[in-house]
């Protein structure tokens, strides 16, 4: 086909409004004015163009913009931002909290996309700290964000946030930011009930010490061994045969089948097998009978 | 779930005019645009216009731009599209249908159709 | 307006065989392509949208293919439900417009 640069007769765009939607993508490059589109830009999320034609409103942007889009432009991109690559968005300053939310907002439902990321990568490095509204934002739409941060970026993270967060958004969370958010989750959910509370806390017990764990096991919380084999082994270790028993209810026969792992098998070594005998499970390994434990590590510290 | 129930089936005479609702549930009615397509008896589909049911903004194929009017009643879910001086040609089951995403318009839900014959 | 024809008008195909259905655009409409089923007495449901990602819920049987003017849906393996008409649809631009439709039936 004929390359078609001249606008029709008639068919100058003088604003942006539905009428473009009929616009062959060629008539859209020929007709309408870059300047035009970035002072309407309010309007183009307004009108349902086609995933095609909004490759030539973004070409004209990029010709009127080829250092980066302003602000004004950036907060009415709406299903334009879809188009953006992360090179694209790297050129961008933004530093409104509502412009963050409008994009976020055309991204909703979906995984968090390359363009995504960059785009939070700049808001937050543009804002010097992540404080509570920003995070407040990020995790209504990506609770899972918090596991992307490090140790250091989630010290930031006001309890409160914390309310925001699903089980399923702490699966990619390692122990070290668990050791961070466990602390907030307590602060956050400490009104609550013991049930109450330990349904809420538990997602975030891989990061809870020892007197913690002690403190639940008086609760009756029923304690699913799915929970128990993702706690730090260093807060299981100290816990008795009589506090396991407790803190996992009926869920204690479970106990034998993880025998051979982590955080199970460490704590079994560390038990008299008099005491594990009592579970009736058949649990091997304990200590046995007339030794005498001695705490090394407390013994290398004093030398 | 999504679900557009339209109105029943329509006889008219030439020249009159017919009026199809379609009821909308299981979604935010004012989120989506709101298509209409038609489909005449062993044809083709044959797209019609759009509504956006938030802000009443419309579009209409300029095949029927002049004949057409789409209108919503928000506090329904109701969507309407009124065909008026109706010819013979025009007897087909007309559909709404919803597009999710207004960057990629495929029709992701049909209502069931309405048959609408125009005879004298 | 982008006209989109489809062939054949109508096709028929043993049980268990391959289908083919071609779709070609007027113009170049890249992979703005959508393929939808129609069942007799039935609104048209979605199959195939982006030329060849397959819609929720539908069998891997249905494989679509193609850019630019020529698109393919294809039928890996007939099954008796799958006697229906099929449409392709471009949205590359507006007025968004439609094949005229492929019936396919039972050998």
């Known amino acids: 086909e004929v390359e078609k640069t001249a606008c029709p007769s008639g068919k100058k765009a003088r604003e942006i409004d539905e009428s473009l939607i009929f616009y062959k993508k060629w008539e859209l490059e020929a007709c309408v004015d870059a300047a035009l589109l970035a002072t309407q830009m309010d309007r183009v999320n307004a009108i349902p163009f086609t995933y095609e034609q909004l490759d030539v409103l973004k070409h004209k942007l990029d010709e009127l913009y080829p250092q980066g889009y302003p602000e004004s432009v950036i907060q009415h991109l709406g299903y334009l931002f879809l188009k953006m690559s992360p090179e694209d968005i790297r050129k961008w300053n933004v530093t409104s909290l509502e412009t963050l939310k409008a994009l976020l907002e055309v991204n909703k439902g979906h995984e968090m996309s390359p363009q995504v990321a960059t785009l939070i990568d700049r808001f937050v490095k543009g804002r010097g700290q992540l404080d509570k509204d920003t995070l407040d934002t990020l995790t209504a739409f990506y609770p899972g964000y918090l596991c992307s941060l490090s140790p250091e970026e989630l010290s930031s993270v006001p309890p409160s946030s914390i309310w925001a967060v699903r089980p399923q958004d702490l699966d990619t969370c390692d122990p070290r930011q668990l050791d961070v958010l466990y602390p907030k989750a307590r602060l956050a959910f400490q009104n609550m009930n013991g049930s109450e509370y330990f349904v809420k806390i538990q997602s975030f017990l891989g990061g809870a010490p020892t007197e913690d764990l002690k403190a639940l096991s008086q609760q009756n919380v029923s304690m699913d061994l799915a929970t128990f084999m993702k706690l730090r082994t260093d807060a299981v270790l100290p816990l008795t045969v009589a506090e396991v028993q407790k803190l996992l209810g009926p869920h204690v026969e479970g106990l034998k089948a993880e025998e051979r792992h982590r955080p199970v098998r460490d704590w079994i070594l560390r038990q008299r097998q008099d005491d594990l005998d009592t579970l009736g499970l058949g649990l091997q390994g304990g200590i046995p009978n007339g030794y005498l434990v001695l705490d090394l590590s407390m013994q290398e510290a004093l030398s | 779930q999504v679900q557009l129930v339209q109105s029943g089936a329509e006889v008219k005479k030439p020249g009159a005019s017919v009026k199809v609702s379609c009821k909308a549930s299981?979604?935010?009615?004012?989120?989506?645009?709101m298509h209409w397509v038609r489909q005449a008896p062993g044809q083709g589909l044959e797209w019609m216009g759009w509504?956006?049911?938030?802000?009443?903004?419309?579009i209409y194929y300029e095949k029927f731009q002049g004949r057409v009017t789409m209108t919503v009643d928000k506090s329904i879910s109701t969507a309407y599209m009124e065909l008026s001086r109706l010819r013979s040609d025009d007897t087909a089951v007309y559909y709404c249908?919803?597009?999710?995403?207004?960057?990629?318009?495929?029709?992701?839900?049909w209502g069931q159709g309405t048959l609408v014959t125009v005879s004298s | 307006d982008i006209v989109m024809t489809q062939s054949p008008d109508s096709l028929a195909v043993s049980l268990g065989e391959r289908a083919t259905i071609n779709c070609k655009a007027s113009h170049d409409v890249g992979q703005s392509v959508a393929w939808y089923q129609q069942k007799p007495g039935q609104s048209p449901k979605l199959l195939i949208y982006w030329a060849s990602t397959r819609h929720t819920g539908v069998p891997d049987r249905f494989t679509g293919s193609g850019s630019g003017t020529d698109f393919t849906l294809t039928i890996s393996s007939l099954q008796a439900e799958d006697v229906a008409v099929y449409f392709c649809q471009q949205y590359s631009s507006y007025p968004l417009t439609f094949g005229a439709g492929t019936k396919l039936e039972i050998k």
């Open positions: 249908a919803i597009i999710i995403t207004p960057v990629v318009p495929k029709f992701d839900y």
């Open positions: 299981g979604y935010t009615f004012t989120s989506y645009w």
């Open positions: 509504i956006h049911p938030n802000s009443d903004n419309t």
